[in-house]
Amino acid sequence: PLATIPVSTTSLTSSEGSTISTPSVDISTPVTTSIVGDQCSRCKNGGFWDGLKCQCLTPYYGESCEEVVNSIDIAPPETVSAQMELTVTVTSVKFTDELKNHSSQEFREFNKTFTEQMNIVYSGIPEYVGVNITNLRLGSVVVEHDVLLRTKYTPEYKTALDNATEVVKQKITKVTTEQIMTNDNCSALMCFNTTGTQVQNITVTQYDPVEECRQKAEEYEDYFLVEYRDQKPYCISPCESGFNASKNCNHGKCQMSQNGARCLCVTTETHWYSGEDCNQGTQKSHHHHHH
């Protein structure tokens, strides 16, 4: 036997003024039907029947996946990062082929000293995580390395990381200008060739909550938007209450359609409500029925 699908109706009036009954299952829309055991379900909009209920795809929900959610979960990363590819020339160490071998004593000691030196140079940058040597080559020692930066995600993360990369440039330029060999002597942990300092490339984490929101909203992308609360982005439709963009339907219910958010106005025992925001009330005339 096929399971009966309960269809409840609510007396609602669209903002155009006509009274409509909105079934929880829209029979007029073609649906895919899957039969599992003796259960039958109509799951719309790509949803599938799991044996008990419809499993809906974002942004849909409801008994038959016929309704559009008011908000979509978007999850920005906890932290965002930047990677700067830099080159500096160290003059206080003689280049040997052993430096190319990352498991050699020469490389390990050079790496330790270079890392210590860079930790000192960048000590005042809160976003600084560390350095990673990618290649060492002749000349005295040309050090190709990455400077790693990280910060907590906030809407302004790009500005924070951009500022940090600028400070990195300033600090590496300063140290490689000041810590130089004089009279064949280097009195610092490491000495540099001023002209060998170059920033090759900067890569910053790309995260756009608006883009994620639009992608997840699919065909409703034009009607979902991102609003922030406590520096956290929320992907909402105008039907979600409590935000700047929230639609106030007064005496009605907000519903998403492919043309955007609209208000379905209620009819009470005493009033009809109409208007785009269901804020125009018309009192019903009272008829006396005699038995």
């Epitope: 160490v93 003689k94 040997t96 004593q105 000691e109 064949d184 009195s187």
Partner: nanobody, 124 residues
Framework: EVQLVESGGGLVQPGRSLRLSCAAS???????MGWFRQAPGKEREGVAG???????GYADSVKGRFTISKDNAKNSLYLQMNSLRAEDTALYSC???????????????????RGQGTQVTVSS
């Protein structure tokens, strides 16, 4: 990691001599080596240094009295201290640079390996 172990310290009378030794666990041929000292309540100071190519440097206070040398074959560093004075009393430690370090002709250089030290007390 390079391990450095100092020896030769002790109690000595003013005007006498002492020879400090520093045994390294690895090759010191391609390293700058140095001796440092720290007296109670004072900052650590460079005493003497020797570069990879044998060039030496000394603190003004010890010039003409102390001599630094190294024996690459034995991976050892030495500090010959003559005409010792009461103000030479300190904990003496040896230090080594990273491999292939060049340009360490002054004593302000920061070495990356350092021993525990040996105590020298000059007193009558």
């Amino acid at each position: 990691e390079v391990q450095l172990v100092e020896s030769g310290g002790g109690l000595v009378q003013p005007g006498r001599s002492l020879r400090l030794s520093c045994a390294a666990s690895g090759d010191i041929t391609r390293r700058c080596m140095g001796w440092f000292r720290q007296a109670p309540g004072k900052e650590r100071e460079g005493v003497a240094g020797i570069s990879e190519d044998g060039i030496t440097g000394y603190a003004d206070s010890v010039k003409g009295r102390f001599t630094i040398s190294k024996d690459n074959a034995k991976n050892s560093l030495y500090l010959q201290m003559n005409s010792l004075r009461a103000e030479d009393t300190a904990l003496y430690s040896c230090a080594a640079s990273i491999l292939n370090r060049v340009g360490c002709r002054q004593l302000s250089y920061e070495y990356i390996y350092r021993g525990q030290g040996t105590q020298v007390t000059v007193s009558s």
